[in-house]
């Protein structure tokens, strides 16, 4: 007997062939004996079976003597035997659907669970690999699952179905619900304008929901909420917004936040949240601000920056074209009685520059002027 | 070129018989699924019956089931329909006509057709 | 058996008129629809075939369209020979079955 494999929603073809390579009379039934088509002559003829509407042929073969039978829309409940009868012959053919859907939604957010359940036919024991779109494998029976999904998780799932040595192949699209980046570094001279941005990495046709800035200033004892808002249809409108400081936020995606002035006050760290409509749980994403002062007072050139710095960067005090004259892993540095020129401060990782901030240091009968 | 003559046609008391005779030139017919046509005086088209390649397998419609029998003979290259127990309803012009191939069923060729006439 | 419903059932153009006729299927019958000629006293011609094909001889101001359950017959421009009855039918399943006629009159 020959097993066929579909899938379910999909359509398939039976085969049958007659030696006779010429139209003759041909029935289909199905284990039942129950008739599902057949022809008379050059016509189609059905019979009452529960895929009347679904069963059909196809008739340009049949001068040929191939006399397929051709079920659309499958469903789990199709597996049958079906039998083609032709020329005081029969075939049989045994048809097993499967169908692999994703728990609820194929929309998950970034840590969420992801279960594929896979419909088979009573008696049959198929198994099951799937292979996420970062080549990672999984296994299992009626039921896989990924726990902690990850954006590298978004794509097309490649999934195979093994039965009696067939397989069939389904693909589900999986999307990730995230941003870019999980958390991102905006490094800035004191006075300069803040740019956030919090790119999206996954597009939606409509996308509702809302979202809140709370910010952790370094210097404060408590986080605060800056800024609350709402999208609609991708429209971002703002509800709420601290007078101090006053943020702007862009109408459109991405979302995009301006901070007027980078002050030390403002330096620290933030988590953006997204809840979007009918999804259980939120996007998030963490910002830092570090925020740098260079300032003269007296005989005293200092260079301080404020916010969340790894031990591992480095905080200089230079003059122009000059070796540094200090080099620190503080937040803070001081040069005494510092030549005249231009200074720099620079903070950077492994000789990489962050931030850089210049001073001039007039001779000491003139007052410093800061560019 | 393919033509289709019709004959036989007439008029028959009902409860009586009559047989048509379809004559075809230009193929041959026993190559064909061949069926007659009929339409009553003023109406609509009603296919009627059909027989299909050697004659083994023979189609009618449900209003004529039992009482018309479909026939050919490949030597004189003729279809003929033999009608027994004929009604006041049966009354109509009879065309033969030629469907196509499976993957064009439609009727190609028609006779011209004969009338028949049941009354008392 | 496939019901097959024609309108109108009578129709009056004049001479380079566009006309329309439809035909709806009782259910899904594909593109397996042909439209027929008959003029009083003949036989019927086949003048459409497989819903949209032209069967070769006949004028290219004939020509059929739709496929499922609707279906049209369409006469660019009428010519004086054009004024008969027109039929579709369906050929998906046995019995074949005819629409009960479209008679086109001239005006």
């Known amino acids: 007997k020959k097993v066929v494999l579909g899938k379910k929603g999909d359509t398939v073809e039976l085969t049958c062939t007659a030696s006779q390579k010429k139209s003759i009379q041909f029935h289909w039934k199905n284990s039942n004996q129950i008739k599902i088509l057949g022809n008379q002559g050059s016509f189609l003829t059905k019979g009452p079976s529960k895929l009347n509407d679904r069963a059909d042929s196809r008739r340009s073969l049949w001068d040929q003597g191939n006399f397929p039978l051709i079920i659309k829309n499958l469903k789990i409940e199709d597996s049958d035997t079906y039998i083609c009868e032709v020329e005081d012959q029969k075939e049989e053919v045994q048809l097993l659907v499967f169908g692999l859907t994703a728990n609820s939604d194929t929309h998950l957010l970034q840590g969420q669970s992801l279960t594929l359940t896979l419909e088979s036919p009573p008696g049959s024991s198929p198994s099951v690999q799937c292979r996420s779109p970062r080549g990672k494998n999984i296994q299992g029976g009626k039921t896989l699952s990924v726990s902690q999904l990850e954006l590298q998780d978004s794509g097309t799932w490649t999934c195979t179905v093994l039965q009696n040595q067939k397989k069939v192949e389904f693909k589900i699209d999986i999307v990730v619900l995230a941003f870019q980046k999980a958390s991102s570094i905006v490094y800035k001279k004191e006075g300069e304008q803040v740019e956030f941005s919090f790119p999206l990495a996954f597009t939606v046709e409509k996308l509702t929901g809302s979202g809140e800035l709370w910010w952790q200033a370094e210097r404060a004892s408590s986080s605060k909420s800056w800024i609350t808002f709402d999208l609609k249809n991708k429209e971002v409108s703002v509800k709420r917004v601290t007078q101090d400081p006053k943020l702007q936020m862009g109408k459109k995606l991405p979302l995009h936040l301006t901070l007027p002035q980078a002050l030390p006050q403002y330096a620290g760290s933030g988590n953006l949240t997204l809840a979007l409509e009918a999804k259980t749980g939120k996007l998030h994403q963490e910002v830092n601000l570090v925020v740098m002062r260079a300032t003269q007072l007296q005989k005293n050139l200092t260079c301080e920056v404020w916010g969340p710095t790894s031990p591992k960067l480095m905080l200089s005090l230079k003059l122009e074209n000059k070796e540094a004259k200090v080099s620190k892993r503080e937040k803070a540095v001081w040069v005494l009685n510092p030549e005249a020129g231009m200074w720099q401060c620079l903070l950077s990782d492994s000789g990489q520059v962050l931030l850089e901030s210049n001073i001039k240091v007039l001779p000491t009968w003139s007052t410093p002027v800061q560019p | 070129e393919v033509q289709l003559l019709e004959s036989g046609g007439g008029l028959v008391q009902p409860g009586g018989s009559l047989r048509l005779s379809c004559a075809a030139s230009g193929f041959t017919v026993g190559s064909w699924y061949m069926s007659w046509v009929r339409q009553a005086p003023g109406k609509g088209l009603e296919w009627v019956a059909g027989i299909w390649y050697e004659g083994s397998n023979k189609y009618y419609a449900d209003s004529v089931k039992g009482r018309f029998t479909i026939s050919r003979d490949n030597s004189k290259n003729t279809l003929y329909l033999q009608m027994n127990s004929l009604r006041a309803e049966d009354t109509a012009v009879y065309y033969c006509?030629?469907?196509?191939?499976?993957?064009?069923?439609?009727?190609?060729?028609w006779g011209q057709g004969t009338l028949v006439t049941v009354s008392s | 058996d496939i019901q097959m419903t024609q309108s109108p059932s009578s129709l009056s153009a004049s001479v380079g008129d566009r006309v329309t006729i439809t035909c709806r299927a009782s259910q899904d019958i594909r593109s397996y629809l042909a439209w027929y000629q008959q003029k009083p006293g003949k036989a019927p011609k086949l003048l459409i075939y497989a819903a949209s094909s032209l069967q070769s001889g006949v004028p290219s101001r004939f020509s059929g369209s739709g496929s499922g359950t609707d279906f049209t017959l369409t006469i660019s421009s009428l010519q004086p020979e054009d004024f008969a009855t027109y039929y579709c039918q369906q050929s998906y399943t046995a019995p074949p079955t005819f629409g009960q006629g479209t008679r086109l009159e001239i005006k």
């Open positions: 006509a030629r469907l196509g191939t499976a993957s064009l069923p439609y009727f190609d060729y």
